[in-house]
């Protein structure tokens, strides 16, 4: 997991490489400015959306090379003993709220699975990532609104749950969890884009995705 420093770094999508490049450009231009991640993500997403297949090519090549690197490194990687042991999770603890992207996936996954029954879970996720990535900020708004509402509810629920006191096994992880909460939330804005948004394999000639008509 995240604990093993020897574990190969996860492979990056073309969109993640693009965001990284944007971030580097931004840092060069404004070295002292702090980044508003949601604004930055929105700008990146809009810019990616209007890029041509040729412009995206550079990032797709980077992603292909990184995928090859990851696969090569994973072949020789041996996970440490006890890696699979899961830390105690209280079944009564409030569930973490879904992200806007996750809510979006719940809407469109049935269609993609229904029309492409042979697709692997990974390929369905990739298609959903492409779709989200090609969705304008205005169109994402209802999902983001709902995700924010659920996050707000979760924060209230988790506060109440913590106030009540937890089972001893869970208590140990709480201090650490509290400390890392702020850092985690800052990182999440970036991870949402990088982990959840896959690249768009744009073709020169568009095809119809829908093949469901009876």
């Amino acid at each position: 997991g995240k604990g093993d420093p020897k574990k190969p770094r996860g492979k990056m999508s073309s969109y993640a490489f693009f965001v990284q490049t944007c971030r580097e450009e931004h840092k060069k231009k404004h070295p002292d400015a702090s980044v508003n991640f949601s604004e930055f993500s929105k700008k990146c997403s809009e810019r990616w959306k209007t890029m041509s297949a040729k412009e995206k090519g550079k990032f797709e090549d980077m992603a292909k090379a990184d995928k090859a690197r990851y696969e090569r490194e994973m072949k020789t990687y041996i996970p440490p003993k006890g890696e699979t042991k899961k830390k105690f999770k209280d079944p009564n603890a409030p569930k973490r709220p879904p992200s806007a992207f996750f809510l979006f996936c719940s809407e469109y996954r049935p269609k993609i699975k229904g029309e492409h029954p042979g697709l692997s879970i990974g390929d369905v996720a990739k298609k959903l990532g492409e779709m989200w990535n090609n969705t304008a900020a205005d169109d994402k708004q209802p999902y983001e609104k709902k995700a924010a509402k659920l996050k707000e509810k979760y924060e209230k629920d988790i506060a109440a749950y913590r106030a009540k006191g937890k089972p001893d096994a869970a208590k140990k992880g709480v201090v650490k969890a509290e400390k890392s909460k702020k850092k985690k939330e800052e990182e999440e804005d970036e991870e949402d884009e990088e982990d959840e948004e896959e690249e768009e394999d744009e073709e020169d000639e568009e095809e119809e995705e829908d093949d469901d008509d009876e």
Epitope: K49, E107, G114, M131, T135, E206, E207, E209
Partner: antibody, heavy 122, light 107 residues
Framework: EVQLLESGGGLVQPGGSLRLSCAAS????????MHWVRQAPGKGLEWVSR????????WYADSVKGRFTISRDNSKNTLYLQMNSLRAEDTAVYYC???????????????WGQGTLVTVSS | DIQMTQSPSSLSASVGDRVTITCRAS??????LNWYQQKPGTAPKVLIY???SLQSGVPSRFSGSGSGTDFTLTISSLQPEDFSTYYC?????????FGQGTKLEIK
């Protein structure tokens, strides 16, 4: 054959209400975004509203926000538009249409229903 | 909102003519642009989606091009059934917006 059939239009007084229905057939209704588009007599097309496949998420044109409500019943393959506080400027033919996506996730409207006329007049 | 401006608003042409209708977006929309044809008293019908892809069943005399802010619909050789009104529409964001339409009439 993919078909959309609107109903529920008619003459209504300003401030009144009307509920439009759109019956879908020939495709898996629950997979698709659905939209309402209207056309005032002798004028161009105006997008009105959109609803996500499950019905959980909705979008509206500013001109109808707070007055119109889009909904769907996937078990009945039917799309609805509840129109309240109607104004003279809402007079139009209302079309329901399906949002289709290309492999690059570009959306377009296909097919369209035949439309239902809503007249708001005293 | 993204404004879509079509030109010309109306156009007179003859059977066999080559006709071009243009559509301009108020901001860059990539290739998120569709073209529809509407005959009097009937619902619109999609001709071109994603700026240049021909909808199945639409004659090949219709073609679309452009990206960013400027788009064109071309009819290479007008047929009698092509005299109708044409609309462009952006699907880049919400609200979806249409051009005001171009009425194609017989000269």
């Amino acid at each position: 054959e993919v078909q959309l059939l609107e109903s529920g239009g008619g003459l209504v007084q300003p401030g009144g209400s009307l509920r439009l229905s759109c019956a879908a057939s020939g495709f898996t209704f629950s997979y698709y975004d659905m939209h309402w588009v209207r056309q005032a007599p002798g004028k161009g097309l105006e997008w009105v509203s959109r609803i996500s496949p499950s019905g959980g998420y909705t979008w509206y044109a500013d001109s109808v926000k707070g007055r119109f409500t889009i909904s769907r019943d996937n078990s009945k393959n039917t799309l609805y538009l509840q129109m309240n506080s109607l104004r003279a400027e809402d007079t139009a033919v209302y079309y329901c249409t399906r949002g289709r996506y290309t492999s690059g996730w570009h959306e377009y409207f296909d097919p369209w229903g035949q439309g239902t006329l809503v007249t708001v007049s005293s | 909102d993204i404004q879509m401006t079509q030109s010309p608003s109306s156009l007179s042409a003859s059977v066999g003519d080559r006709v071009t209708i243009t559509c301009r977006a108020s901001q860059s929309i990539g290739t998120y642009l569709n073209w529809y044809q509407q005959k009097p008293g009937t619902a619109p019908k999609v001709l071109i989606y994603a700026a240049s892809s021909l909808q199945s069943g639409v004659p090949s005399r219709f073609s679309g091009s452009g990206s960013g802010t400027d788009f064109t619909l071309t009819i290479s050789s007008l047929q009698p059934e092509d005299f109708s009104t044409y609309y462009c529409q952006q699907s880049y964001n919400t609200p979806r917006t249409f051009g005001q339409g171009t009425k194609l009439e017989i000269k």
